[in-house]
C-alpha cells in the first residue's frame, strides 16, 4: 500500500487490489486493479 | 464460514523447507478463495499467497514469489503453502484465512475467517 501527500494538504490513499479472473469469467489467473479514495479505477 | 485449523509449523534452518498445512471444515469449502497471511514480532499482518477456488489461479506476495507455493486440494478440504528457501525474515506466525468469492485477495478485510495460526521461525 503507498500513500501520498499532495499539497492541498490532504492524503490520497493508493492500495492494489487483486482478484481471481474465475470469480468473474471463465479465465485463470488474477486481475489487479488499483483504488484510490475508494473507488476501484483500473 | 468455515472452521480452519493450520499445522507443519516449526523451528529450521536458513536454506530450508517446511510444508504448512489448512484443515478446513464444512461442506461450502470450494465457495472460498484461501489465503495465507503471515504476522512477525511487532508487526502487523501480511498477505502471503492466495488460491482460487478451483486450484487453478494462485497469486503471491513479492517477498516470496519463487519460493512459496500455494495449493489445494477440494476432495480433503485442505490447503497447502509449501516454503522453501526460507530466510530469518520469513520468521512469523502464519495463518490460514478463507474469502468469498469475488473479494480482493490480497487484503485482510476480505477474508471472514480465521485460523488460529502456525509459528514458524527461521533460524541457525
Known amino acids: 500500500d503507498a500513500e501520498f501527500r499532495h499539497d492541498s494538504g490532504y492524503e490520497v490513499h493508493h492500495q492494489k487490489l487483486v482478484f481471481f479472473a474465475e470469480d468473474v469469467g471463465s479465465n485463470k489467473g488474477a486481475i489487479i486493479g488499483l483504488m484510490v479514495g475508494g473507488v476501484v479505477i483500473a | 464460514e468455515v472452521q480452519l485449523l493450520e499445522s507443519g509449523g516449526g523451528l529450521v534452518q536458513p536454506g530450508g523447507s517446511l510444508r504448512l498445512s489448512c484443515a478446513a471444515s464444512?461442506?461450502?469449502?470450494?465457495?472460498?478463495?484461501m489465503g495465507w497471511f503471515r504476522q512477525a514480532p511487532g508487526k502487523g499482518r501480511e498477505f502471503v499467497a492466495a488460491?482460487?477456488?478451483?486450484?487453478?489461479?494462485?497469486y503471491y506476495a513479492d517477498s516470496v514469489k519463487g519460493r512459496f507455493t500455494i495449493s489445494r486440494d477440494n476432495s480433503k478440504n485442505t490447503v497447502y503453502l509449501q516454503m522453501n528457501s526460507l530466510r530469518p525474515e520469513d520468521t512469523a506466525v502464519y495463518y490460514c484465512?478463507?474469502?468469498?468469492?469475488?473479494?480482493?485477495?490480497?487484503?485482510?478485510?476480505?477474508?471472514?475467517?480465521w485460523g488460529q495460526g502456525t509459528l514458524v521461525t527461521v533460524s541457525s
Open positions: 464444512g461442506r461450502t469449502f470450494n465457495n472460498y478463495n
Open positions: 488460491v482460487s477456488r478451483s486450484g487453478v489461479s494462485t
Open positions: 484465512a478463507a474469502a468469498y468469492r469475488g473479494t480482493a485477495i490480497n487484503v485482510r478485510r476480505s477474508y471472514d475467517s
